[in-house]
């Protein structure tokens, strides 16, 4: 694979994870109820990371925005953040990228130049798509812990009616913004990773391209290592550089989006 | 205006089929949740179906689940109840009604009267 | 399946008097997600269908009367009627509308002396 071709496609598969990192995080379904202990429920409750919403079989949904900073969870408020920070990283990442593309020409930037800023943008993108695999990935463990501790007391306070009457506490499982972030999130890293591969393509090798001219005893003649590269002339200016063919492929984008059912 | 408005309620011998529609008016069907409610000679209301809003899911009550089948055409406005393999005991007189906030049914139609009698 | 137990089955009252019915659930009503009950009261009149009167165990339905008011969470509602017309009696029914089956409770009947 050409170095250009690498970077351009480093960026699109960042930029497809990156616009799936802002969707997951704006999305309201992080959360869904668990519908196996009630499977035929009229209401169906789903929470995302800004407000929690109820959708009745009537075909009304009703959301709540989380309207408090202070009596929210830490962990809610740490995934929030860690979002947001693979969103900022993210547009910066794109812009710098965007600079950084072979295929764009900006003035007189030259290679090592762009090598940088091709880097730069590669390890905003690795660490935008480390920042939304965590984040995820905190919130579904918070999830599963708070699963098995409402399981273990699923039917609480056993009052009223002597007894006899079952309060069933809602549970809550993976929504489809979980999947979403994942798949987001190692878009965002595989793109990045290319990015940096593609850096390396772009960056100059100095004894490729630095004439060296030395005299021999009795002879003048000037010898350009690496100059007799297969047609590219004596006095070129062409630069030969490494192409990395290496393992920067995706699986053919084979990114699978979660349905979302409508359990109610 | 909206209106509901049943049709489709017979006399019929146990084991027979009767197809209920529900002609809905002042609003577009496929936006809510429908459900039929049937009133038995001795006064008692007794959900029946609900299919919700877009028509994804439907929910049968027990003593009419694999015999009755809930049902819409967008299009015409109109909500069905398709009903089969009728006993005694299915006879009511059946309501249609939209689903409103809370599930709570807004409006119902006057109903039709379903006899299932030898 | 919810069951719901209407109390009492009937009641004979005067016209003005304050009126109060009480409906139970065998599983708690109250939705975590909006803390909301999903119980619904309706009204209905000798050859008429049901009227909808209160949803939300307590948000009374836009042209009813402000003398009906419905209370409780949880398992344990109450629709009171503070003054009573003779329009008022009819058969009121309570409705879990929270889990399917959607079931109804038997009906107060409300009755003039």
């Known amino acids: 694979m050409s170095v250009t071709a690498c970077q351009g496609l480093g960026f699109v598969v960042s930029l497809i994870g990156f616009a799936g990192i802002i969707a997951a995080t704006c999305m309201d379904q992080w959360s869904t109820q668990d519908l196996y202990n009630n499977p035929v429920t009229a209401v169906f409750n789903y929470q995302g990371l800004w407000r929690s919403c109820v959708r009745e079989s009537s075909g009304f949904t009703e959301c709540r925005g989380y309207f408090t900073l202070l009596g929210l969870p830490a962990m809610l408020q740490a995934v929030r953040a860690l979002m947001i920070v693979g969103i900022v990283l993210g547009v910066i990442g794109i812009l710098v990228s965007i600079f950084a593309l072979k295929c764009i020409r900006i003035g007189s930037m030259d290679d090592s130049a762009k090598a940088k800023m091709t880097l730069t943008s590669g390890i905003l993108f690795i660490i935008s798509g480390i920042c939304a695999i965590i984040g995820v990935s905190v919130f579904a463990n918070m999830l599963v812990t708070n699963f098995w501790m409402s399981t273990a007391n699923m039917y609480s306070g056993m009052g009223g009616m002597g007894g006899m009457v079952q309060t069933v506490q809602t549970r809550y499982t993976f929504g489809a913004a979980l999947f979403v972030g994942w798949v987001a999130g190692g878009l965002t890293l595989i793109g990045g990773v290319m990015m940096c591969i593609a850096c390396r393509g772009l960056t100059p090798d100095d004894s490729n391209f630095k004439a060296v001219s030395y005299h021999a005893s009795g002879q003048n003649v000037a010898y350009r290592p690496g100059g007799f590269k297969a047609s590219t002339g004596f006095g070129s200016n062409t630069r030969n550089k490494k192409i990395y063919d290496g393992g920067a492929r995706t699986e053919d984008d084979e990114q699978s989006h979660p349905t979302k059912y409508d359990y109610v | 205006e909206v209106q509901l408005v049943e049709s489709g309620g017979d006399l019929v011998q146990p084991g027979g089929s009767l197809k209920l529609s529900c002609a809905a008016s002042g609003f577009t069907l496929s936006r809510y949740g429908m459900s039929w409610v049937r009133q038995t000679p001795d006064k008692r209301l007794e959900w029946v179906s609900t299919i919700i809003s877009g028509g994804i899911n439907t929910y049968y009550s027990d003593s009419v689940k694999g015999r009755f089948s809930i049902s819409r055409d967008n299009a015409r406005n109109t909500l069905y109840l398709q009903m089969s393999s009728l006993k005694s005991e299915d006879t009511a007189m059946y309501y249609c009604?939209?689903?409103?906030?809370?599930?709570?049914?807004?409006?119902w139609g006057q109903g039709t009267a379903v006899t299932v009698s030898s | 399946d919810i069951v719901m137990t209407q109390s009492p089955s009937s009641l004979t009252v005067t016209a003005g008097e304050k009126v109060t019915m009480s409906c139970k659930s065998s599983?708690?009503?109250?939705?975590?997600?909006?803390?909301?009950?999903?119980l619904t009261w309706y009204q209905q009149k000798p050859g008429q269908p049901p009227k909808l009167l209160i949803y939300w165990a307590s948000t009374r339905e836009s042209g009813v009367p402000d003398r009906f008011t419905g209370s409780g969470s949880g398992t344990h509602f109450t629709l009171t009627i503070s003054s009573v017309q003779a329009e008022d009696l009819a058969v009121y029914y309570c409705?879990?509308?929270?889990?399917?089956?959607?079931?109804f409770g038997a009906g107060t009947k409300l009755e003039l002396k």
């Open positions: 599983q708690s009503l109250l939705n975590s997600g909006n803390q909301k009950n999903y």
């Open positions: 009604g939209r689903l409103y906030y809370g599930n709570a049914m807004d409006y």
């Open positions: 409705q879990n509308d929270y889990s399917y089956p959607l079931t």
